[in-house]
Interface confidence: low
C-alpha cells in the first residue's frame, strides 16, 4: 500500500496499488534550497542537478563533525518527498539544488537572499519552463527576505514555503510570512495538527495550507537505498511543491495567484482539529489540507475565490486594519471582525491603484480584522457605490445602477461608537437583488462588478434572535463573493467567509442579556461566471 | 589573517576612490529604517544588507557601496562587501561595525538596513 | 504502557474539599486534552471539566461551575481536578480520560471513589 | 444542553443473534463542512471504566471487534452487534461531542436472554 501521505493527497480516481497520477510535473523545475543533498540515492539519482551555488556560515562548535550523511540528511528527504521515484508526490519533475543550510541545518537571510539572485539570474540567463522554489527553511520575521520573495513571484516563479516549526503564529517568521509565498503547515494522519517535541506547526492568516508533514517516508542519506521518515513543516512544503510542479506541468500558463486558488479550490476542507490551535488563531487559520487536483482540465474554469485576513489592527480608538488581494485578484468584498464587537465596520478603498479592504476599530475595542474576499475573475471592472446613514427605520439602502454591473459584495461603515439595537425591516425586497441593506446610522457601500458572463444572487439566512454562529453557504457551481451581517447592530462581532459560507458571529447570547428584537443575518453573495463555463464546454 | 587582508584591499580601494566627491552630507528628508531580528538569538550583527530605494539604476549599488566604504575609512573603520544585488533588490550585503549604521542611513538612494540574522531548516 | 490511573478520592464532609489526581503515562500528555467523568452509584456517565493539551483553556458542566478547578502540571504528566464546596450529590466515581482532541474520550482510568457525608 | 436520549433502557438477547440499541439527540450532532458526526458509543462493562467503541458515529475504535458497528446521522443514531458473545454484557452509552457541555445518554444495559 502506498504511504498515507501519498494517498493523503491523492484524488480517489487516481487511486490504484501504485501512486501514479498522470503528466508527473516533468515540464516543471523545482530549485530546493537546503543543505547539501545525495544525489546518488537511488530515489533522486538522474532527476537532480546540484548546483554549484554554497552560501552558509560555519557550523557551531569546535568538535562538529561534517558527516556527509548528516550534512546531506535534511535536503535529502525533502528532495525525495518532491520527486523521489518510490515516495515523490512529483515523480517526473527536475529538480536543482542550492546549498544554503550548513551540516547543522542552519543558514543565514543573507545567504538565502543570494540562492534567490542566483535563481532570477538564471532565469533570466536560460529561461525555461514554469520554476518552483522550495524554501523548507525559516528564521524570524524579515523585511529584506520578504520584499526578495516578492519580486521572485512577480518574476513568475513560485514559491513554496514551511510555515515554521515553533507552534506560533507563522507572520512572526519569514518567509512564511511573505504574502507572495505560498506558506504550508503540517497535518498528520489524523488530520492533526503536527505535534514536534514541545513544538509543532506554526498556524494562522499567514498560512496558506496544510500539507502531510508527521512520519513521511523518504529518501535518507545513510546510504544510496536507505529511507527515512521525517516530520515537519518542510516535509508538507515539499508534498505542496510536488503538487505544485504537478498543477504547473497539466497547466504550464498558470499564474501563481491561479496556482494558489487552485491548490485552496482542491484541497480538503474542515477536516483538521481546530483545538489544537490557540482560541485566538483558529479563525484565522485556513483548515484545508493539499490534494491533488481530481482531474488535468475544467479546472480554470470557475470562479475561484478566497479570503484573506488583515493583521489585527491593534487596540487605539481610531486603528485600522488592511486585507489585500493579491496581484492578479480582484477584491470582490470586505468585511469585518473584532472578538470584542466594538468595531466600526469596513469599507474598500483604493490603495496604489488597487482595491483594498480596510475595517475600523471602535473605542474601547480590542482591535478588528479586516477580511477580503479575493477573486480570480478575467476582464473584471469594479467600483463602489455608497449611501449615506439614510437616518431612518427603513435602514440604509444602495444598489448598483450601472448597466452590466452585478452586486458582489456588501460592506457598512458607522461614525457612531455603538450602533445600538435596531430591528431591520423586511431584509430585502423582493425584485432588487442588486442592493445592499445596513443599519439606518451606517453608510452602505457595494461593490459592484461587470465582467464577461459574470451572475450573482443574494442568498440570506435569518434568525429572530441572535445565535453565536449564523451561516449560509452557496450552492454547488457558485462561489461565495460577498459575506456581511444584517443588519450589523452591536452585538454582531462580524462575518467572513470560510470556503463557500458566510459566517456570521455575534457576543455569546446569554452575557448579552439581548431581546428578540435583535435579528441578525447572514448575507451571502453567490457569483458565477456564464462566460467560463462556455468557455470550459468548448474546450471539452 | 586572509580577511583582513581583504579588508585593508578594500580600504585602500576606498580611500583612492574619488567617487561623489566623498561628501558626507546626507540627503534632505532621508527617512531610511534600521531592522533586525526580533529574535534576539538569531541575530547576526556585523553583517548588514543595505537595501536601496527600488528605482534606484543598478550601477548606484556598487557605487553607494563603494561610498560607504570611504566615509567609513574616513572614520577609521574598515568594511567589506560581501556581495551586491542587481537582480532582485537593488542592494549590497556589507560586513561593518554597528557603530556605522547611523553614517550608512544617511547615505543616498538608501531605502532600509537589515541587519544579518539566522534561519533554520523546517 | 498507555494508562490513567487516579487517586486522591475518599469521605469528605459537605462543604469540604478534595483534590483528585490522575497520573498519565505511555502517551504524549502535552498533545492532548483531558477531561474529567463522574459516575454516580448505579447511575450513568456525567461529564466533569475538560482541559487543552496547553492547559489554556478550561470547560466544565454547570452543575460543577465555581466550585471544581481541572488543572494539569507538564513536567509531572499529571492531571488534578480540586473539589471545593462539595455536596453529596458530588459523590461518584470520578473517571479521568484522554481526550482524542476532538472531544471523545479514548483511554480511561479505573477511576476513584469520592463519598460527599455527613 | 443537548440530550442524548437511548433506547432502550435495558436489552436482552440470546448467544449469536443480533443486538440493536438507539441513541437520538436534542439537535444534530452532525457538522456540515466536514460532514462528520460528533457522536461516540462506550461500553463499560461490570467494574470497569467505559471503553470507546465507535466514534465518528460509525469509525470502530483500533482493536475493536468488526462485530460492533455504529450508523446514523444528524440526530438518530445505532450500535449494532451483528453477534452478540458473552463478553458483550455490558451497559452501553453514547455521547455527543458535538459541543461542551459533553453529554452522554442514560445507557442501556444488555444481557443474554
Known amino acids: 500500500s502506498i504511504p498515507w501521505n501519498l494517498e493523503r493527497i491523492t484524488p480517489a480516481r487516481y487511486r490504484a496499488d501504485e501512486y501514479q497520477p498522470p503528466k508527473g510535473g516533468s515540464l516543471v523545475e523545482v530549485y530546493l534550497l537546503d543543505t547539501s543533498i545525495q544525489s546518488d540515492h537511488r530515489e533522486i539519482e538522474g532527476r537532480v542537478m546540484v548546483t554549484d551555488f554554497e552560501s552558509v556560515p560555519e557550523e557551531d562548535g569546535t568538535r562538529f563533525h561534517r558527516q556527509a550523511s548528516k550534512c546531506d540528511s535534511h535536503g535529502t528527504h525533502l528532495a525525495g518527498v518532491v520527486s523521489g521515484r518510490d515516495a515523490g508526490v512529483a515523480k517526473g519533475a527536475g529538480l536543482r539544488s542550492l546549498r544554503v543550510l550548513n551540516c547543522q541545518g542552519k543558514g543565514t537571510v543573507s545567504g538565502t537572499l543570494i540562492g534567490l539572485e542566483f535563481i532570477r539570474k538564471s532565469q533570466l540567463v536560460q529561461p525555461v519552463g514554469p520554476l518552483v522554489v522550495l524554501l523548507p527553511l525559516a528564521g524570524g520575521y524579515s523585511r529584506v527576505f520578504n520584499a526578495a520573495c516578492q519580486r521572485l513571484a512577480r518574476a513568475g516563479v513560485v514559491l513554496v514555503t514551511a510555515a515554521g516549526n515553533f507552534r506560533d503564529d507563522a507572520c512572526l517568521y519569514s518567509p512564511a510570512s511573505a504574502p507572495e509565498v505560498i506558506t504550508v503547515g503540517a497535518t498528520n494522519a489524523q488530520d492533526q495538527p503536527v505535534t514536534l517535541g514541545t513544538l509543532g506547526t506554526n498556524f494562522g492568516r499567514c498560512v496558506d495550507l496544510f500539507a502531510p508533514g508527521e512520519d513521511i517516508i523518504g529518501a535518507s542519506s545513510d546510504c544510496s537505498t536507505c529511507f527515512v521518515s521525517r516530520s515537519g513543516t518542510s516535509q508538507a512544503a515539499a508534498h505542496v511543491a510536488g503538487i505544485a510542479a504537478m498543477m504547473l506541468s497539466a497547466e504550464p500558463e498558470l499564474t501563481l495567484a491561479e496556482l494558489r486558488q487552485r491548490l485552496i479550490h482542491f484541497s480538503a476542507k474542515d477536516v483538521i482539529n481546530e483545538a489544537w490551535f490557540p482560541e485566538d488563531q483558529r479563525v484565522l487559520t485556513p483548515n484545508l489540507v493539499a490534494a491533488l487536483p481530481p482531474s488535468t482540465h475544467r479546472a480554470g474554469w470557475q470562479l475561484f475565490c478566497r479570503t484573506v485576513w488583515s493583521a489585527h489592527s491593534g487596540p487605539t480608538r481610531m486603528a485600522t486594519a488592511v486585507a489585500r488581494c493579491a496581484q492578479d485578484e480582484e477584491l470582490l468584498s470586505c468585511s469585518s471582525f473584532s472578538r470584542s464587537g466594538k468595531r466600526r465596520g469596513e469599507r474598500i478603498e483604493a490603495q496604489g491603484g488597487k482595491r483594498v479592504c480596510r475595517a475600523h476599530n471602535a473605542f474601547g475595542g480590542e482591535g478588528v480584522y479586516a477580511i477580503a474576499r479575493c477573486c480570480l475573475l478575467p476582464q473584471v471592472n469594479c467600483s463602489v457605490h455608497t449611501a449615506p446613514p439614510a437616518g431612518a427605520s427603513m435602514g440604509t439602502r444602495v444598489h448598483c445602477h450601472q448597466q452590466g454591473h452585478v452586486l458582489t459584495g456588501c460592506s457598512s461603515h458607522w461614525e457612531v461608537e455603538d450602533l445600538g439595537t435596531h430591528k431591520p425591516p423586511v431584509l430585502r425586497p423582493r425584485g432588487q437583488p442588486n442592493q445592499c441593506v445596513g443599519h439606518r446610522e451606517a453608510s452602505i457601500h457595494a461593490s459592484c462588478c461587470h465582467a464577461p458572463g459574470l451572475e450573482c444572487k443574494v442568498k440570506e439566512h435569518g434568525i429572530p434572535a441572535p445565535q453565536e454562529q449564523v451561516i449560509v453557504a452557496c450552492e454547488d457551481g457558485w462561489t461565495l463573493t460577498g459575506c456581511s451581517a444584517l443588519p450589523g447592530t452591536s452585538h454582531v462581532l462580524g462575518a467572513y467567509a470560510v470556503d463557500n459560507t458566510c459566517v456570521v458571529r455575534s457576543r455569546d447570547v446569554s452575557t448579552t442579556g439581548s431581546t428578540s428584537e435583535e435579528a441578525v443575518a447572514a448575507v451571502a453573495i453567490c457569483c458565477r461566471s456564464r462566460h467560463l463555463v462556455q468557455a470550459s464546454q468548448e474546450l471539452q | 589573517q586572509e580577511d583582513e587582508d581583504g579588508d585593508y584591499e578594500e580600504l585602500v580601494l576606498a580611500l583612492r576612490s574619488e567617487e561623489d566627491g566623498l561628501a558626507d552630507a546626507p540627503e534632505h528628508g532621508a527617512t531610511a529604517t534600521f531592522h533586525r531580528c526580533a529574535k534576539d538569538p538569531w541575530r547576526l550583527p556585523g553583517t548588514y544588507v543595505v537595501v536601496l530605494k527600488e528605482e534606484t539604476h543598478r550601477s548606484q549599488s556598487e557605487r553607494t557601496a563603494r561610498r560607504l566604504q570611504a566615509q567609513a575609512a574616513r572614520r577609521g573603520y574598515l568594511t567589506k562587501i560581501l556581495h551586491v544585488f542587481h537582480h532582485l533588490l537593488p542592494g549590497f550585503l556589507v560586513k561593518m561595525s554597528g557603530d556605522l549604521l547611523e553614517l550608512a542611513l544617511k547615505l543616498p538612494h538608501v531605502d532600509y538596513i537589515e541587519e544579518d540574522s539566522s534561519v533554520f531548516a523546517q | 504502557e498507555v494508562q490513567l490511573v487516579e487517586s486522591g478520592g475518599g469521605l469528605v464532609q459537605p462543604g469540604g474539599s478534595l483534590r483528585l489526581s490522575c497520573a498519565a503515562s505511555?502517551?504524549?500528555?502535552?498533545?492532548?486534552?483531558m477531561n474529567w467523568v463522574r459516575q454516580a452509584p448505579g447511575k450513568g456517565l456525567d461529564w466533569v471539566s475538560t482541559?487543552?493539551?496547553?492547559?489554556?483553556?478550561?470547560n466544565y458542566a454547570d452543575s460543577v461551575k465555581g466550585r471544581f478547578i481541572i488543572s494539569r502540571d507538564s513536567s509531572k504528566h499529571t492531571l488534578y481536578l480540586q473539589m471545593n464546596s462539595l455536596r453529596a450529590e458530588d459523590t461518584a466515581v470520578y473517571y479521568c480520560?484522554?481526550?482524542?482532541?476532538?472531544?471523545?474520550?479514548?483511554?480511561w482510568g479505573r477511576g476513584t471513589l469520592v463519598t460527599v457525608s455527613s | 444542553d443537548i440530550v442524548m436520549t437511548q433506547s432502550p433502557d435495558s436489552l436482552a438477547v440470546s448467544l449469536g443473534e443480533r443486538a440493536t440499541i438507539n441513541c437520538k439527540s436534542s439537535?444534530?450532532?452532525?457538522?456540515?463542512?466536514?460532514?462528520?458526526?460528533?457522536l461516540g458509543w462506550y461500553q463499560q462493562k461490570p467494574g470497569q471504566p467505559p471503553n470507546l467503541l465507535i466514534y465518528?458515529?460509525?469509525t470502530r475504535e483500533s482493536g475493536v471487534p468488526d462485530r460492533f458497528s455504529g450508523s446514523g446521522s444528524g440526530t438518530d443514531f445505532t450500535l449494532t452487534i451483528s453477534s452478540l458473545q458473552a463478553e458483550d454484557v455490558a451497559v452501553y452509552y453514547c455521547?455527543?461531542?458535538?459541543?461542551?457541555?459533553?453529554?452522554f445518554g442514560q445507557g442501556t444495559k444488555l444481557e443474554i436472554k
Open positions: 480520560a484522554k481526550d482524542s482532541n476532538w472531544g471523545n474520550f479514548d483511554l
Open positions: 505511555g502517551f504524549t500528555f502535552n498533545n492532548y486534552a
Open positions: 482541559i487543552s493539551g496547553s492547559g489554556g483553556t478550561t
Open positions: 439537535q444534530s450532532v452532525l457538522y456540515r463542512s466536514n460532514n462528520r458526526n460528533f
Open positions: 465518528w458515529a460509525s
Open positions: 455521547q455527543q461531542y458535538y459541543t461542551t457541555p459533553y453529554t
